[in-house]
C-alpha cells in the first residue's frame, strides 16, 4: 500500500494548562523507519517526540504503538504552555544505518493555538 501520512486537523486550540491531542495516521509502515513529531520546518525545526523508545516529559503516544500493525502515531501533549504554540508535523523516515534516517513523507501540519486561561 502506498505510504501516506495524514494529519486530519489543520489546527487545534487549547487552553494553557490543559492537554491536547495531535492526530497522525499512516497508510503503510513500509519502508521501515521511525516516525517523529517536529514543531516548525527547515533546519531549525524542533524535535518534539520520536516513536523510538525515548521518554519525553508531558508527551505520550495515544495508541499502543507496540502493536506490530499500529498505524496511529498520534500524541497527547499535557500541561500546554504558550511556548508550545506552533505548527506540528508528523514525519515518516526510512531507516538509515551508516547514514542518517531519510525523511520520506510529512503530514500537512497541525497548528496549535494556546489560549490564555
Amino acid at each position: 500500500k502506498e505510504l501516506k501520512v495524514t494529519q486530519p486537523e489543520k489546527s487545534v486550540s487549547v487552553a494553557a494548562g490543559d492537554s491536547t491531542v495531535l492526530n497522525c495516521t499512516l497508510t503503510s509502515l513500509l519502508p521501515v523507519g521511525p516516525i517523529r513529531w517536529y514543531r516548525g520546518v527547515g533546519p531549525s525545526r524542533l524535535l518534539i517526540y520520536s516513536f523510538a523508545g525515548e521518554y519525553v516529559p508531558r508527551i505520550r503516544n495515544v495508541s499502543d504503538t507496540t502493536k506490530r500493525n499500529n498505524m496511529d502515531f498520534s500524541i497527547r501533549i499535557s500541561n500546554v504552555t504558550p511556548a508550545d504554540a506552533g505548527i506540528y508535523y508528523c514525519v515518516k523516515f526510512q531507516k538509515g544505518s551508516s547514514e542518517p534516517d531519510t525523511e520520506i513523507q510529512s503530514g500537512g501540519g497541525t497548528e496549535v493555538y494556546v489560549l490564555a486561561k
Epitope: 509502515l29 521501515v32 521511525p34 523510538a52 523508545g53 507496540t66 502493536k67 551508516s98
Partner: antibody
C-alpha cells in the same frame, strides 16, 4: 536494572501441557512489547510469539499457532506462554525477551528448560 | 532465511566482521545477539541495525545495507569468544527470524 526471570519449565510427556512464566522488574513492564524465543539442544534461536504492551495483539510463528498462547498480566509484571499438545520437538530452553520499539530484543531472560519425553 | 558464516576466527586485537544476509532493507531491522555457552541467556550487542546498548563495549558496532547486515568487532578480545546470532524483524510479515549462528574463536 532490567531483570527477566523465566520459570515453569520441567519434564512432561508428549501431548501434555505446560505454562511458562516470566517475571519482569526494573522497567515499566506495561510499556513494552514482549516475546518468547526458544533454543533446542545444539540448535539456534527460534522466535515463537510476541505480544503488544497492552496485551491486545499477539503474533506467532506458524509452527506453534493454535498450540501455544502468549499472554501477559501487567498488574503482576508477568508474561506467560501456555503450551499445549507438546511433542519431543518442543524440547528446548525457553527465553522471554523484551522488545525494542522496532520489535528486536534488548533484554533476555535466563531461560527455563522444557523437556518433552515419554 | 538469514544466512551467516558458521565460524570465524581471529587473533586478539584484530578486527572481525560477521555478515548476515537474506533480509530486505526496505522492510527489515537487524540485531546481533551474543551467547557465550549453549543454553545461557543471550546478550544483545546491537539492535536497530547499528544501536549499541549502553553496557556493551564500543568495540562492537553494526551496520546494514542492501540485503545484509554486518557486525564488526574492532580489537577483538578473548572474552568475545561466543556464538553470535543475527536476528531480523520483518515489517512486512510482522515476524522475527534468526540466523543459525556464527562461532567466533579468538586464537
Amino acid at each position: 536494572d532490567v531483570q527477566l526471570v523465566d520459570s515453569g519449565g520441567g519434564v512432561v510427556r508428549p501431548g501434555e501441557s505446560l505454562r511458562l512464566s516470566c517475571a519482569a522488574s526494573g522497567f515499566t513492564f506495561s510499556s513494552y512489547a514482549m516475546s518468547w524465543v526458544r533454543q533446542a539442544p545444539g540448535k539456534g534461536l527460534e522466535w515463537l510469539a510476541g505480544i503488544s504492551a497492552g496485551g491486545s495483539d499477539t503474533y506467532y510463528i506458524d509452527s506453534v499457532k493454535g498450540r501455544f498462547t502468549i499472554s501477559r498480566d501487567n498488574s503482576k509484571n508477568s508474561l506467560y506462554l501456555q503450551m499445549n499438545s507438546l511433542t519431543a520437538e518442543d524440547t528446548a530452553v525457553y527465553y522471554c525477551a523484551r522488545e525494542t520499539w522496532n520489535h528486536l530484543f534488548d533484554y533476555w531472560g535466563l531461560g527455563t528448560l522444557v523437556t518433552v519425553s515419554s | 532465511a538469514l544466512t551467516q558464516p558458521a565460524s570465524v576466527s581471529a587473533n586478539p586485537g584484530e578486527t572481525v566482521k560477521i555478515t548476515c544476509s537474506g533480509g530486505d532493507y526496505y522492510s527489515t531491522y537487524y540485531g546481533w545477539y551474543q551467547q557465550k555457552s549453549p543454553g545461557s541467556a543471550p546478550v544483545t550487542v546491537i539492535h536497530s541495525d547499528d544501536k549499541r546498548p549502553s553496557d556493551i563495549p564500543s568495540r562492537f558496532s553494526g551496520s546494514a545495507s542492501g540485503s545484509a547486515a554486518t557486525l564488526t568487532i574492532t580489537g577483538v578480545r578473548v572474552e568475545d569468544e561466543a556464538v553470535y546470532f543475527c536476528g531480523a524483524y520483518d515489517g512486512r510479515t510482522y515476524i522475527n527470524t534468526f540466523g543459525a549462528g556464527t562461532t567466533l574463536t579468538v586464537l
